[in-house]
């Protein structure tokens, strides 16, 4: 029989880690190894059709890619469909799809509301989603001792997929679920450079664990202006949440790494400034499969899609892909050897989720939700070199964290900052002897009023449901 | 609650090796780093070397480097520390001892001691 | 490696004095130093770690200072349960060295 994949990815844009470009050399060769192994779909052929889910400007859509999923539906009838990754573009097309009953199978929609399996039936993420990402953040507050307060600091993009709105919004929810902790938000427009210095007062009184989503330069810019603010390593500590590692890429992210240098004359202030930062990343699988499946990822791009792929985390998502469908094929496999159909999207995915399975990505954990548990790694910088190394990985399944090659974590006065003041945020420990503090710190403390309306919070509701905010 | 539990008391001929083991409990073992520490009779603390569990990195004091080698098994949660060509001056109390590398409090929990006699 | 050099070797104090126990880096070690108590037969105790954190269940009366190259440790009541061997510890990097150790003896 014939087995049909609808695939709803960007086609001509190459920059989205789902891009067609990238993922489809790694379900060729998935659906290679498919053909190759006569345990797997014995006597059916998958074919792939293709549909975008950009506008005709290039970007994710969430108008074309549910007309684009329409028309594959009624075209081809697939068996499933592969994407979208975009979160705009995947939440339409996961309502549909929940309503065809047809499996909808991606390694990118990551934000917290695809986990909804009510509105979102049969959708299956193979690749990492930002609630997991709650997950090792809420682990290491709990190992570090940071069971009060948190901040979290965001930055708005005009025009794109708001990928730092989802990030914050998976970690916030996740964390205050798992840990009785006040995690406050705060969004900013990148560029706006006054904005930051706002943002930084705002910063002094709420908070001394900070994550961070922004640009590699953004990042850097808030850290210069933290320094010049005062605000350092021995109090504050900031977690710049580049899950791709683009900070950790490029030309000062060759080895060693120093994300904070740029020689553009500030590099003596920005590694003085990044003994106070540290940045988690997706963690880069180290299985010898997954070097082998990137070098014929490579040449296959190269020779059949005419694009070259770049070294980086950006290549766990095409792997991801890769890994999701041959769970898939062996969820249909198993269906159909227990008499049922290929149509059947409910039995068939109920088979992929909360199971093990072995991958170029190594040792891959669906949930029993049909998300995957995901790995993260925490680099640091050593305060000798100023070269920013993984010191832990977080495993998704164990929920462990692990230390590694005899790295510790570089605190300025020894020991991690509390993430409370000894006497509060406006100092209002009575415990605290107020003369100790001088009228200069005072009036670095802005009210809330001051900011006015360039405060935005994330509202419960905007985190629950997809819209442009 | 944390321990660490060491083998027994050992003597040993001068030229034999000796493996002391340390066994790690009431923690997630992947998660700290175990540091080994000799004490040579009425004599001071010296720091033998450090493993990380997770992934087996070493790292030893130059004294012993080339006669020490550390361990571990996560399947059972213990760290070995193998040391060959004993002479009398081996003759010392071994402590296995664990570090956490995120918080940075070094040596934080101990195990009891293993004594090595080193004796023709 | 980096060389700790603890002071004085041995001291003989009373109960309820005030005693100070040095320790110096032979190069620079942030915060980065522990101060440990032994007792014969005992394996080391931690009191202090990054310099002037007090390890918890380790009585108030210990309390650490310095940072850089020059560290103290400090009982400011010596009780009959104190009389030691005391041992600075480097943790800044790969090898960890000790102090040689101070014997606090009851005078």
């Known amino acids: 029989g014939n087995l049909t994949v609808a695939v709803v990815l960007p086609l001509a844009n190459t920059s989205y880690p789902w891009s067609w470009a990238r993922v489809g050399p790694a379900v060729e060769l998935a659906l290679a190894k498919v053909k190759a192994r006569p345990d797997l779909l014995p006597g059916w052929t998958v074919r792939t059709v293709l549909g975008s889910s950009e506008s005709a400007l290039g970007v994710c859509s969430d108008t074309a890619a549910p007309l684009t999923a329409v028309d594959l539906k009624w075209e081809h009838n697939p068996a499933v469909f592969l994407g979208p990754g975009c979160v705009y573009a995947a939440a339409p097309v996961g309502r549909f799809t929940a309503h065809w009953r047809v499996p909808l199978l991606t390694a990118g929609a990551p934000a917290l509301g695809f986990g909804a399996k009510d509105e979102y039936a049969l959708t299956t993420r193979a690749g990492p989603s930002h609630a997991k990402l709650g997950d090792f953040v809420a682990a290491l507050h709990r190992r570090l001792g940071w069971e009060r307060q948190a901040l979290v600091l965001y930055a708005y993009q005009p025009g794109d997929d708001q990928p730092c709105f989802f990030v914050v919004g998976g970690l916030y929810m996740r964390v205050r679920d798992r840990l009785n902790i006040t995690v406050d938000h705060l969004e900013f427009a990148e560029g706006d450079r006054d904005h930051y210095t706002l943002l930084l007062r705002t910063v002094r009184r709420k908070g001394r664990v900070i994550y961070i989503c922004s640009s590699p330069d953004t990042f850097r810019t808030l850290m210069l202006l933290a320094l010049e603010a005062g605000l350092s390593g021995e109090d504050y500590v900031f977690f710049h949440l580049d899950l791709f590692g683009h900070s950790l890429q490029g030309a000062h992210g060759l080895v060693p790494r120093r994300p904070w240098e740029r020689e553009d004359g500030q590099d003596v202030s920005a590694h003085q400034a990044f003994q106070a930062a540290k940045i988690i990343t997706y963690k880069e699988p180290d299985n010898p499969e997954y070097l082998e499946f990137l070098r014929k990822l490579k040449h296959l791009a190269r020779e059949q899609f005419n694009f070259t792929m770049e070294d980086g985390l950006v290549n766990t998502i095409p792997a991801a892909f890769h890994d999701g469908l041959l769970l898939y094929a062996q969820a249909v496999t198993e269906t159909l050897a227990h008499g049922g159909t290929v149509t059947d999207g409910e039995s068939i995915t109920q088979r992929m989720w909360n199971r093990s399975f072995q991958g170029v990505t190594g040792y891959l954990k669906m949930d029993s939700n049909g998300d995957r548990e995901t790995d993260f790694s925490l680099w640091d910088m050593d305060p000798e070199t100023g070269a920013f190394r993984v010191v832990l990985n977080f495993n998704g399944t164990s929920q462990e964290l692990v230390t590694v090659s005899g790295h510790t974590l570089n605190w300025p006065l020894g020991h991690p900052p509390p993430d409370v003041p000894r006497c509060g945020f406006d100092n209002e420990d009575p415990a605290c002897n107020q003369d100790h503090f001088s009228t200069l710190e005072e009036q670095k403390l802005i009210s809330e009023e001051d900011l006015g309306g360039e405060q935005k919070l994330i509202s419960e509701e905007d985190l629950h449901h997809h819209h442009h905010h | 609650q944390v321990q660490l539990v060491q083998s027994g008391a050992e003597v040993k001929k001068p030229g034999a090796s000796v493996k002391v083991s340390c066994k790690a409990s009431g923690y997630t073992f992947t998660s700290y780093y175990i540091h080994w520490v000799r004490q040579a009779p009425g004599q001071g603390l010296e720091w033998m070397g450090i493993?990380?569990?997770?992934?087996?990195?070493?790292s030893y004091a130059q004294n012993f480097q080339g006669r020490v080698t550390m361990t571990r098994d996560t399947s059972t949660n213990t760290v070995y520390m193998d040391l060959s060509s004993l002479r009398s001056e081996d003759t010392a109390m071994f402590y296995c001892?664990?570090?956490?590398?995120?918080?940075?409090?070094?040596?934080?929990?101990w195990g009891q001691g293993t004594l090595v006699t080193v004796s023709s | 490696a980096i060389q700790m050099t603890q002071s004085p070797s041995s001291l003989s104090a009373s109960v309820g004095d005030r005693v100070t126990i040095t320790c110096r880096a032979s190069?620079?070690?942030?915060?980065?130093l522990g101060w440990f108590q032994q007792k014969p037969g005992k394996a080391p105790k931690l009191l202090i770690h990054a310099a002037s954190s007090l390890q918890s269940g380790v009585p108030s009366r210990f309390s650490g200072s310095g940072s850089g190259t020059d560290f103290t440790l400090t009982i400011s009541s010596l009780q009959p349960e104190d009389f030691a061997t005391y041992y600075c510890l480097q943790d800044y990097n790969y090898p960890f060295t000790f102090g040689q150790g101070t014997k606090l003896e009851i005078k």
């Open positions: 190069q620079g070690i942030r915060y980065d």
């Open positions: 493993i990380s569990p997770s992934d087996g990195y070493t």
């Open positions: 001892a664990r570090n956490d590398p995120l918080t940075t409090v070094a040596l934080d929990y």
